[in-house]
Interface confidence: low
């Protein structure tokens, strides 16, 4: 064309893949009627018309952008839509009259690629290679034009370093005119990278400006031979009888040596290996204090073949003995005096304490509980705890039973028993004593007796209710050697003035329970008239 | 004591099936990389497939990739090679070996399992 | 890619015999050498720069120069008569493993 050279630099639309391009004819009312002019695209130099404007009224030519022109802006401005990266050329237009001037536009087409795709070498890098090895590959897909690439480790940029840093990038165009990048990163990596974090940063333009996404952050598994083995025992802190404790070896280097765990003998000072689970861990379930002593680890480096040492350990189990109490079960007369004494042993300082079994009540801080002056009501259990107070849950009790001389004690000495007739009644009767009672009815029925303790007893009698027992009443009698006691119950029928819904009743220290005898699984808990309670 | 077992080898005709199996102990089995490795009789050794010590990714020789899958289930220390569409030129003897540093080195090997494929 | 080895060699009993292995990945890599006897499997003899696997007598050595590994046994025993392979990652796909085709040596 005449006078090309001497044409300005053609004017830049910058757009992005998919949208819209307006491509605006630049010539002047005195270069060009824009109601005839014709429109070209530029390929390798070659033209091709693509769009023809007549009396204002655009017509597309047939080829590849037949269908995405028209006119806008009084026919000043040619549309193209749904750009692609091949739309990247210059477009012209060219007026005819009053003579032949054209106008130049260059449409410049941007794409963001997608989110950069980090894969790391799973199979890992050892730090003794020859040369960098593959640390992880970066993929960005579908960006236009190419994206740059910029790996990072810890953040900061990698640059290529000859031996240790080598970054292989790699491109493919897509069937959409589209650029997938590939970036590997290679490098020589040291033990200290093991928990180095590595990720990649696409570059790319928009018609906005410059911009960039960034990979997630990958680890890469480092191999390193083994320079140290220790010993780490779970749960920290002090050790106690019954914990479950977990002794592992742990090395610096990776894959982990071959580990084994070995227990100094005491008696022979020898190293004697320790039976450990699959994943070579020592675990002591429930640890006893045998368990204490001097451990350590060897573990044998595959890749050196050296075996490393770890620090021995001393492993205290702490503990406490069997109590022992003494006496061990003392039997005593009343108004005499009893001295009980708690020994036990301990890898600690132990704190004993006396308790009253039946009450929890403390009694005595100390090994040492003295009795005095011995009444029947102190009779009963007495536990002895002995604790190491600087180990929360370290202690053992031991019970013992003081049994006082004497003959049967009633838990009531007479009581009243609402019932009606016919119906089975369940009676009960509980008696205390040493030697422990025993209990028999003036009446059949089906009687059972349980021992409550040492010194306590209660039995249970299941009886029809008859008007000959509504007559005599029930009584138990509870008999020991040092003699018996007996216990009454009267039998009063209920009717419907006896019980009114405000009647102020209550029960006794037992209850019965009346049963209609002709239907067996009804019962009902008989409700008692105040009375005084009485011991015998 | 670091110990593979391999298993599962036999007569197969050409285009049939087998499923090799390897079991592993003495070793934290899901820490390494695992190899199978076959031997032609009277020929030298042959890399057939690999696998990552999660199981997550595998790699396959030339000779058997599309027809060869190697697997493994770490709950049970046990690596596998299923081989379909088998050829006369798969007779071998396969070993398991486990693979230190994920590449370097086959540090252990088991004693092998006989393939044969005829009609 | 692919490892080269020469077929077979032979060594008087108490002297000294190197085998080589040749290929472009030993530019990268170190080549790892397994000593396989009749009927038996394969073990490790030398790995990484010049490391004894675990029982292997010190006579035997590895040592790398170029695109060349060497495998030497120094005062050869009868017991080291066996088929010799060399191994390494292949440099056009680091996850893929070559071996050399190996060498027989015979102690006379």
């Known amino acids: 064309v005449p006078g090309e050279a001497e044409q300005p630099a053609p004017e830049l639309v910058e757009v992005e893949v998919g949208s819209t391009a307006l491509l605006k004819c630049g010539l002047s009312q005195s270069q060009g009627n824009l109601s005839h002019v014709d429109w070209f695209s530029v390929h390798k130099e070659k033209r091709t018309l693509i769009f023809r404007v007549r009396q204002g009224q655009g017509q597309s030519e047939p080829g590849e952008y037949e269908q995405r022109l028209s006119l806008q802006d009084r026919g000043a401005t040619l549309a193209l839509t749904q750009v692609t990266p091949q739309d990247e050329r210059i477009f012209l237009c060219q007026g005819k009259r009053p003579r032949s001037q054209e106008y130049r536009i260059q449409l410049r087409v941007y794409k963001a690629p997608e989110e950069p795709n980090i894969q790391v070498n799973p199979l890992g890098i050892p730090v003794n290679s020859k040369e960098p090895e593959e640390v992880a590959t970066c993929v960005g897909r579908n960006g236009y034009p190419i994206p740059q690439v910029i790996w990072y480790k810890n953040g900061r940029p990698l640059k290529e370093e000859k031996n240790r840093v080598h970054i292989q990038s790699s491109q493919t165009v897509e069937s959409s005119g589209l650029y997938t990048l590939q970036s590997i990163l290679k490098a020589q990596l040291v033990k200290e990278d093991k928990d180095a974090q590595f990720y990649c940063e696409l570059n790319y333009r928009l018609p906005s400006g410059n911009h960039m996404k960034e990979s997630r952050e990958v680890t890469v598994p480092v191999f390193y031979p083994t320079e140290k083995v220790w010993l780490e025992v779970e749960p920290v802190g002090m050790l106690k009888e019954g914990d479950r404790v977990e002794i592992r070896c742990l090395a610096d280097g990776n894959p982990p040596p071959h580990f084994s765990i070995s227990k100094q003998n005491p008696s022979t000072r020898e190293a004697e290996e320790e039976t450990t689970n699959d994943n070579g861990v020592l675990v002591l379930e429930p640890a006893r204090k045998e368990h204490s002593g001097r451990y350590e680890c060897q573990g044998l480096d595959l890749d050196t073949m050296i075996s490393l040492l770890s620090e021995p350990q001393e492993l205290l189990v702490n503990y406490v003995s069997d109590v022992r109490v003494s006496p061990a079960a003392p039997e005593r007369q009343e108004g005499s005096s009893l001295t009980l004494t708690c020994e036990a042993e301990s890898s600690q300082d132990l704190e004993f304490q006396w308790l009253r079994e039946e009450t929890g009540q403390v009694l005595e801080r100390g090994p040492v509980l003295q009795l005095h002056d011995l009444k029947r009501e102190a009779g009963g259990g007495y536990r002895c705890v002995a604790s190491v107070p600087s180990i929360p849950g370290l202690n053992r009790t031991q019970l013992v039973n003081v049994a006082i001389f004497g003959p049967p004690w009633m838990a009531f000495k007479e009581r009243k028993v609402w019932v009606k007739e016919n119906m089975v009644l369940n009676l009960s009767c509980e008696a205390s004593g040493h030697p422990r009672p025993t209990i028999s009815w003036n009446v059949n029925g089906t009687a059972s007796e349980q021992d409550q303790d040492p010194q306590r007893v209660l039995s249970t009698l299941n009886v029809l209710v008859t008007p000959e027992l509504l007559e005599t009443g029930v009584e138990c009698t509870a008999s020991n050697d040092l003699g018996k006691n007996t216990s009454i119950l009267f039998l009063e029928l209920v009717n419907l003035t006896t019980l009114t819904p405000d009647s102020n009743t209550t029960t006794g220290l037992s209850t019965s329970t009346a049963s209609p005898h002709t239907r067996a699984n009804s019962t009902s808990t008989e409700r008692k008239l105040p009375e005084p309670e009485s011991r015998g | 004591e670091v110990q593979l077992l391999e298993s599962g080898g036999g007569l197969v005709q050409p285009g049939g099936s087998l499923r090799l199996s390897c079991a592993a102990s003495?070793?934290?089995?899901?820490?390494?990389?695992m190899s199978w490795v076959r031997q032609a009789p009277g020929k030298g050794l042959e890399w057939v497939s690999a696998?990552?010590?999660?199981?997550?990714?595998?790699y396959y020789a030339d000779s058997v990739k599309g027809r060869f899958t190697i697997s493994r289930d770490n709950s049970k220390n046990t690596l596998y090679l299923q081989m379909n569409s088998l050829r006369a030129e798969d007779t071998a003897v396969y070993y398991c070996?486990?693979?230190?540093?994920?590449?370097?080195?086959?540090?252990?090997w088991g004693r092998g399992t006989t393939v044969t494929v005829s009609s | 890619s692919e490892l080269t080895q020469d077929p077979a060699v032979s060594v008087a009993l108490g002297q000294t015999v190197s085998i080589t292995c040749r290929g472009d990945?030993?530019?990268?890599?170190?080549p790892t050498w397994y000593q396989q006897k009749p009927g038996q499997a394969p073990i490790l003899v030398i790995y990484?720069?010049?490391k004894r696997a675990s029982g292997i007598p010190d006579r035997f050595s590895g040592s790398d120069s170029g695109n060349t590994g060497s495998l030497t046994i120094t005062g050869a025993q009868a017991e080291d008569e066996a088929a010799y392979y060399c191994?390494?990652?292949?440099?056009?796909?680091?996850?893929?493993?070559?071996f050399g085709g190996g060498t027989k040596v015979t102690v006379l």
């Open positions: 696998i990552s010590g999660s199981g997550g990714s595998t």
């Open positions: 990484g720069k010049n």
């Open positions: 191994s390494s990652r292949d440099s056009s796909d680091n996850h893929l493993r070559l």
């Open positions: 990945s030993l530019k990268n890599y170190y």
């Open positions: 003495g070793f934290t089995f899901s820490s390494y990389a």
């Open positions: 070996a486990r693979d230190l540093y994920g590449g370097f080195v086959f540090d252990y």
